[in-house]
Interface confidence: low
């Protein structure tokens, strides 16, 4: 017996109660592929979520987070509160980074400043709660008679943790 369901396009479902007729997905549901025996319920963007893309009969709704929150995870499956630069989110809310750590974003955790001496370099610019230290030439490069042709090492890109 041929499976007539394979003929049902996206946006419909194969209705076994009606001799495998392709029925349109009911309101607030969708099927993104053909041959489906049911339609999936549309995602609802409510509460801390806001709608980025409305649900259609062939594709699910897509959500964003309201102002003051940012998306977390694939397809914005969660929203998390923003903090300021120089802070991290804890169970008790946003807290300032401890001395020796920084966070240059509104999300994520405070990370340790780069240890310039591990690369044989010196601190050119001190770190803050919001910014990593900037490493400069090694102390030996700065001694009298040393060549000054070597430019200072660039600061690490934001958001990259120390190696």
């Amino acid at each position: 017996l041929q499976d007539l369901c394979s003929n049902c396009p996206a946006g419909t479902f194969c209705d076994n109660n009606r001799s495998q007729i392709c029925s349109p997905c009911p309101p607030n549901s969708f099927s993104s592929a053909g041959g489906q025996r049911t339609c999936d319920i549309c995602r609802q963007c409510k509460g801390v979520f806001k709608t980025r893309k409305e649900c259609s009969s062939t594709s699910n709704a897509e959500c964003d987070c309201i102002s003051g929150y940012h998306c977390l995870g694939a397809e914005c499956s969660m929203c998390e509160q923003d903090c300021k630069q120089g802070q991290e989110l804890t169970k008790k809310g946003c807290k300032d980074c401890c001395f020796g750590t920084f966070n240059d974003q509104k999300r994520g955790i405070c990370r340790p400043w780069t240890n310039c001496s591990l690369d044989g370099k010196s601190v050119l610019v001190n770190g803050t709660k919001e910014r990593d230290v900037v490493c400069g030439p090694s102390p030996a490069d700065l001694s009298p008679g040393a060549s000054s042709a070597t430019p200072p090492a660039p600061a690490r890109e934001p958001g990259h943790s120390p190696q």
């Epitope: 509460g47 801390v48 995870g73 969660m78 929203c79 169970k91």
Partner: antibody, heavy 123, light 107 residues
């Protein structure tokens, strides 16, 4: 204090359906996601899915989507997981868990756990 | 799905020793990692969240670290009550996934 109460054990015949319960107390039931987690003997943990009791919004692990159905009864502050067509592979301990914080921000970590229901699938 | 690979699967140590358990994610999970402890026949208990923050009541001999895809749980000066199984879990994306677990036994 927060409590998630689960029956200790369930014996189910292969192919029959089993509905596991998780009775919550000590907090506002509708404000916190409830998760279900599977642990086979001597093995790791597997997340099945979760449900937000306020509006019954669910997320599922695709692996379980066809056979697990999560529901809640707000009047009794109870969450349920129905497992259809179980086989011996479904013999495991099933935990219900609750996320730590209410609403947002939410760490999506499982701070509270029920004692687990041991499901044995056997004829 | 993000796969979590935990190692070692088992280890034995003595009271007072320091041990480290590692967890590798198949993609960047940006510190959205939790560690759980599970005693024989009991439910797991949250130890660490956000990769490094200790849950309430967890002794300071436990510490979490890591970033990107590589994370670790360190237990300093092991106590008798620390023996059992440990699980890591990512909550960066659905489906939430766990490592295979590490069984810590008394030597």
């Amino acid at each position: 204090q927060v409590q998630l109460q689960q029956p200790g054990a369930e014996l189910v015949r292969p192919g029959a359906s089993v509905k596991l319960s998780c009775k919550a107390s000590g907090y506002t039931f509708t404000s916190y996601w409830i998760n279900w987690v599977k642990q086979r003997p001597g093995q790791g943990l597997e997340w099945i899915g979760n449900i937000f009791p306020s509006d019954s919004y669910t997320n599922y692990n695709q692996k379980f989507k066809d056979r697990a159905k999560l529901t809640v009864d707000k009047s009794s502050s109870t969450a349920y997981m129905q497992l259809s067509s179980p086989t011996s592979e479904d013999s495991a301990v099933y935990y219900c868990t609750r996320f730590g914080s209410s609403g947002y921000p939410d760490y999506y970590t499982m701070e509270y756990w029920g004692q687990g229901t041991s499901v044995t699938v056997s004829s | 799905d993000i796969q979590m690979t935990q190692s070692p699967a088992s280890l034995s140590a003595s009271v007072g020793e320091t041990v480290t358990i590692t967890c590798r994610a198949s993609g960047n999970i940006d510190n959205y990692l939790a560690w759980y402890q599970q005693k024989q026949g009991k439910s797991p208990q949250l130890l660490v969240y956000n990769a490094k923050t200790l849950a309430e009541g967890v002794p300071s001999r436990f510490s979490g670290s890591g970033s990107g895809t590589e994370y670790s749980l360190k237990i300093n000066s092991l106590q008798p009550e620390d023996f059992g199984s440990y699980h890591c879990q990512q909550y960066w994306t659905i489906p939430y996934t766990f490592g295979g677990g590490t069984k810590l036994e008394i030597k």
